[in-house]
């Protein structure tokens, strides 16, 4: 099955494909699709490199890695909802049914919303601890402006000292939530 | 526009190796996008795909056929070949030389087809 | 192997009439289907790749649709160079396939 990776609308998305050239500068063709490795090149190519150069590309994808030395990751660029799906990196190596074929699973997730200004202080100023999240690398992580991230463990906690009181009303108000996961 | 010529026997016998020549025109076997392929037909019957072989020098074949078939090219001659081999009366088809350009809008062109009858 | 299996083997219809053909696929080809055309005597030629785009110089009158593991090929008005036999394709999985094909003959 496809190897998933994750980011958010508005982010840069990183989908990882390597290989070893031969020798330095002796480079293969490369493509880049969106849809499962078929058996021809790639579906709905979104890149191409040759043995020189990267000689097709299309806006918001790129390759930001040195693919000269065989770094043919592509990165896309401020993603949307709709760049979910299948990506293929296909290598076409020299011999007999040697291509690497590779089905990278793009999940994008909605941005996390935040707060408006006006009542960012009115939040901070009740909650002032430092809660932090770890997610699986940059692409994971995001803070609310300069709202403290929360952590899963305390979501509870804060829910009941939300409760009830007026803070809450003053947050529905705004119409800030906050996401879980 | 590219154009494909087959060239070869039409009759070869059992056992003997099947060898096609396929005459490239009107573009460069070494260009990208352009999977040159071999593709037979039994006669009154469907489409079997054989191989191809990609300018990088990527090469695939049909499983069923691998352990006979060869294909090659020879760029400075803008030609790429078939080698069958052990061939029998099975192999008896229509063979075509293609080409699919998979570079923008998808399109092939196709050669004449030649008859090869195995047969002694 | 993917399996990919045509109906009607044969449809037999007049000029300016409109023809549905059918290919099913044995697991899901995504939308990497194609259709072929050939007539006696000549090599086939490709008219629609991946479901539902006409290649370079296909009249509109062919149209594809359908994905994962059924298409249909639509001749919306048959013109009397359109009687021949059609071939599904799958370029999916290695190796590609070819349907047994349906023949469109004149009523």
């Known amino acids: 099955s496809e190897v998933e990776y994750r980011a958010e609308v508005g982010q840069n998305a990183y989908l990882p494909c390597f290989y070893t050239p031969a020798a330095p500068g002796n480079l293969v063709p490369v493509c880049w699709g969106k849809g499962a490795c078929p058996v021809f090149e790639c579906g709905n190519v979104v890149l191409r490199t040759d043995e020189r150069d990267v000689n097709y590309w299309t806006s918001r994808y790129w390759l930001n890695g040195d693919f000269r030395k065989g770094d043919v990751s592509l990165t896309i660029e401020n993603v949307t909802l709709a760049d979910s799906g299948i990506y293929c990196c296909r290598i076409q190596i020299p011999g007999i049914m040697n291509d690497e074929k590779f089905n990278l699973k793009l999940v994008i997730k909605p941005a996390k919303v935040t707060p408006a200004p006006t009542r960012q202080r009115d939040f901070t100023a009740a909650f002032p601890r430092m809660l932090t999240t770890r997610g699986h690398g940059p692409a994971e992580t995001q803070t609310l402006g300069s709202l403290p991230d929360i952590n899963l463990t305390q979501i509870s906690t804060l829910a009941n000292e939300l409760r009830d009181s007026r803070l809450a009303n003053d947050l529905r108000d705004s119409g800030a939530t906050i996401r879980i996961g | 526009q590219v154009q494909l010529q087959e060239s070869g026997p039409g009759l070869v016998k059992p056992s003997q190796t099947l060898s096609l020549t396929c005459t490239v025109s009107?573009?460069?076997?070494?260009?990208?996008?352009?999977?040159w392929s071999w593709i037979r037909q039994h006669p009154g019957k469907g489409l079997e795909w054989i191989g191809y072989?990609?300018?990088?020098?990527?090469?695939y074949y049909n499983p069923s056929l691998k352990s006979r078939v060869t294909i090659s090219v020879d760029t400075s001659k803008n030609q790429f070949y078939l080698k069958l081999s052990s061939v029998t009366a099975a192999d008896t088809a229509v063979y075509y030389c293609?080409?699919?350009?998979?570079?923008?809008?998808?399109?092939?062109?196709w050669g004449q087809g030649t008859l090869v009858t195995v047969s002694s | 192997e993917i399996v990919l299996t045509q109906s009607p083997a044969t449809l037999s219809l007049s000029p300016g009439e409109r023809a549905t053909l059918s290919c099913r696929a044995s697991?899901?080809?995504?939308?990497?289907l194609a259709w072929y055309q050939q007539k006696p005597g000549q090599a086939p030629r490709l008219l629609i790749y991946?479901?539902?785009n006409r290649a370079t110089g296909i009249p509109a009158r062919f149209s594809g649709s359908g994905s994962g593991t059924d298409f249909t090929l639509t001749i919306s008005s048959l013109e009397p160079e359109d009687f021949a036999v059609y071939y599904c394709?799958?370029?999916?999985?290695?190796?590609?396939?070819f349907g047994q094909g349906t023949k469109v003959e004149i009523k």
């Open positions: 991946d479901a539902s």
């Open positions: 394709q799958q370029r999916s999985d290695w190796p590609p396939t």
């Open positions: 293609a080409s699919l350009m998979v570079w923008g809008v998808m399109g092939d062109y």
């Open positions: 009107g573009g460069s076997i070494s260009s990208g996008g352009y999977y």
């Open positions: 697991q899901s080809v995504s939308s990497y």
């Open positions: 072989i990609y300018y990088s020098g990527s090469i």
